[in-house]
Interface confidence: low
């Protein structure tokens, strides 16, 4: 799921202090960020042995996942790193800190610490300001749920090094203009607002200038008030697959839900030659079923060594207290020659999805 190199968001760390126990901190990071979660001991006392947990499973340290008693660092984050993270006391399993982490494509809306976009010596004698990373500034509309941390960035250069200032709805924007203040990171060309609220909605403009000129960029921030909704599903492509006998197949389904969803993978089946029951409800068999703690879950159904009877319609179903959402997936299984012919036909049609 990584972006192409030229588009990739280069790594940057975003350290976030832990919330009060029992509260859930909602955090959004960009793909490629270093996700850094900090959980100081409650009341400043001794921490004792802790364990970091993601979506109910203990995290195993690796080259990419660095686990410490008070801090978790996930390097080069991708969509799969989205989920519910908690730091727990090892003995009691008491949750000390709880974070909901979502990793999206750029731009990141976490904070920025690493100074990676500091003003650089451009090698130009004199020059008006210019954007150094315009590809990072494509997303003009940022819509985030209330309580998230938002960051707007305008990485620029020029000689002499330009200054940056920020406007909100066309007027000078300063920390005292919002509860919770703002962080202006001039060396990272960024404006950071923590725990956004609906009154933070508006147009934010960075003005970058030196004596040779001025450039500006406007972003629109929409803060989504959390109104409960049914789960939202996105089917990972390809939703319909053709597989060769004996091969492995994987279906992807992305589930978004503020309320804890009950997620199921189902398969349509026939009972006594009928696909539906007397009341018209389709017959299904439950392949996987679990409650997700995550606001955004990337769920997969893996079918190994498929046979002809694995063919048919599969369902990804998510239910929360508001409603139900479903996505259908189709699998057709063929012997080697039939599958090759189908792929050739698909190739001629200009679209190949190898099973």
């Amino acid at each position: 799921e990584s972006l192409g190199t030229e588009q990739r968001v280069v790594g940057r760390a975003a350290e976030v202090p832990g919330p009060e126990p029992g509260q859930q901190e909602q955090l959004v990071f960009g793909s490629g960020d270093a996700v850094e979660l900090s959980c100081p001991p409650p009341g400043g006392g001794p921490m004792g042995p802790t364990v970091w947990v993601k979506d109910g499973t203990g995290l195993v340290p690796s080259e990419r996942v660095l686990v410490g008693p008070q801090r978790l660092q996930v390097l080069n984050a991708s969509h799969e790193d989205s989920g519910a993270y908690s730091c727990r006391q090892r003995l009691t399993q008491r949750v000390l800190c709880h974070f909901s982490v979502r990793v999206t494509d750029a731009p990141s809306s976490g904070d920025d610490e690493d100074g990676e976009d500091e003003a650089e010596d451009t090698g130009v004698d004199t020059g008006a300001p210019y954007w150094t990373r315009p590809e990072r500034m494509d997303k003009k509309l940022l819509a985030v749920p209330a309580a998230n941390t938002v960051r707007f960035r305008c990485p620029a250069a020029g000689n002499p090094t330009p200054s940056i200032s920020w406007l909100k709805n066309g007027r000078e924007f300063r920390g005292e203009h919002r509860i919770g203040g703002i962080k202006l990171r001039h060396q990272q060309w960024s404006l950071v607002m923590e725990s956004v609220v609906p009154s933070d909605r508006g147009n934010y403009t960075c003005v970058v200038e030196n004596k040779f000129g001025s450039i500006r960029q406007t972003y629109t921030l929409d803060v989504l008030e959390r109104s409960p909704h049914r789960p939202i599903l996105q089917a990972g492509l390809p939703a319909n697959q053709t597989a060769v006998l004996g091969s492995d197949v994987e279906f992807h389904c992305k589930v978004y839900s503020d309320a804890q969803p009950h997620i199921q993978w189902l398969k349509h089946v026939e009972v006594n030659g009928s696909k539906v029951g007397p009341d018209g409800t389709p017959y299904v068999t439950v392949l996987k079923s679990w409650i997700s703690e995550s606001v955004e879950a990337d769920v997969r159904l893996r079918l190994a060594n498929v046979s002809e009877r694995d063919g048919g319609e599969y369902l990804c179903r998510a239910t929360n207290f508001i409603g139900v959402a479903e996505k259908a997936f189709w699998l057709s299984v063929h012997g080697p020659r039939a599958a090759e012919e189908e792929l050739v036909e698909a190739d001629e049609a200009g679209s190949v999805y190898a099973g």
């Epitope: 409960p228 049914r230 207290f321």
Partner: antibody
């Protein structure tokens, strides 16, 4: 604040078409759906269909399939409902309602337009 | 389609009364039920969602309960502005979204 403002009264002849508009303000239009609900004089509420502003996906009530088309214009934050081949039993007040879910319909309708009376009469 | 049946169809009550309206689904809809209030010439207004959650800005005298197939809307102490028509709506199985036929609450 969130508002849905609908177009005005329409009088149509049987067989004609009507297009009702619903202009949204006070929220990010594309992150929600719009459902259309109608109410014949002295009758209850009847759901007509839904459109996702996010991706243009639609779901229509079976009895209206083929006669109704729902569209949106994100540049003006406006939703439209067109009903063709009008009959006298299409005389009703037509409401648009914000559907709080932008991928599938079925969310409680938290904001409604004021209604548009459509009279079909020869 | 899931059918929603409200009872009674109409009801007379006085200010201060406790009033209960019931809604029955033709099959289980878990807690995916919403209640609306509609006054003559006006659009419906959401009162209760998910069977028992009070919509923001709605007075606390309104409450909802039930799950599965049987649901109730209760107004603990009727106020003059509560005389209206009330509709239940299921959001479990869509399309179609289906409403009850309505309960008209009149002044006795």
């Amino acid at each position: 604040q969130v508002q849905l403002v609908q177009s005005g009264v329409e009088v149509k002849k049987p067989g004609a078409s009507v297009k009702v508009s619903c202009k949204a303000s006070g929220y990010t239009f594309k992150f929600y759906g719009i459902s259309w609900v109608r109410q014949a004089p002295g009758q209850g509420l009847e759901w007509m269909g839904w459109i996702s502003v996010y991706n243009g996906k639609t779901k229509y009530a079976q009895k209206l399939q083929g006669r109704v088309t729902m569209t949106t214009d994100t540049s003006t934050s406006t939703a439209y409902m067109e009903l063709r081949s009008l009959r006298s039993d299409d005389t009703a007040v037509y409401f648009c309602a914000r559907d709080g879910d932008y991928e599938s319909s079925g969310y409680p309708f938290d904001y409604w337009g004021q209604g548009t009376l459509v009279t079909v009469s020869s | 389609d899931i059918q929603m049946t409200q009872s009674p169809s109409s009801l007379s009550a006085s200010v201060g009364d406790r009033v209960t309206i019931t809604c029955r689904a033709s099959q289980s809809i878990s807690s995916y039920l919403n209640w609306y209030q509609q006054k003559p010439g006006k659009a419906p207004k959401l009162l209760i969602y998910a069977a028992s959650s009070l919509q923001s800005g709605v007075p606390s005298r309104f409450s909802g309960s039930g799950s599965g197939t049987d649901f109730t809307l209760t107004i603990s102490s009727l106020q003059p502005e509560d005389f209206a028509t009330y509709y239940c709506q299921q959001s479990y199985s869509t399309p179609p979204i289906t409403f009850g036929q309505g309960t008209r609450l009149e002044i006795k």
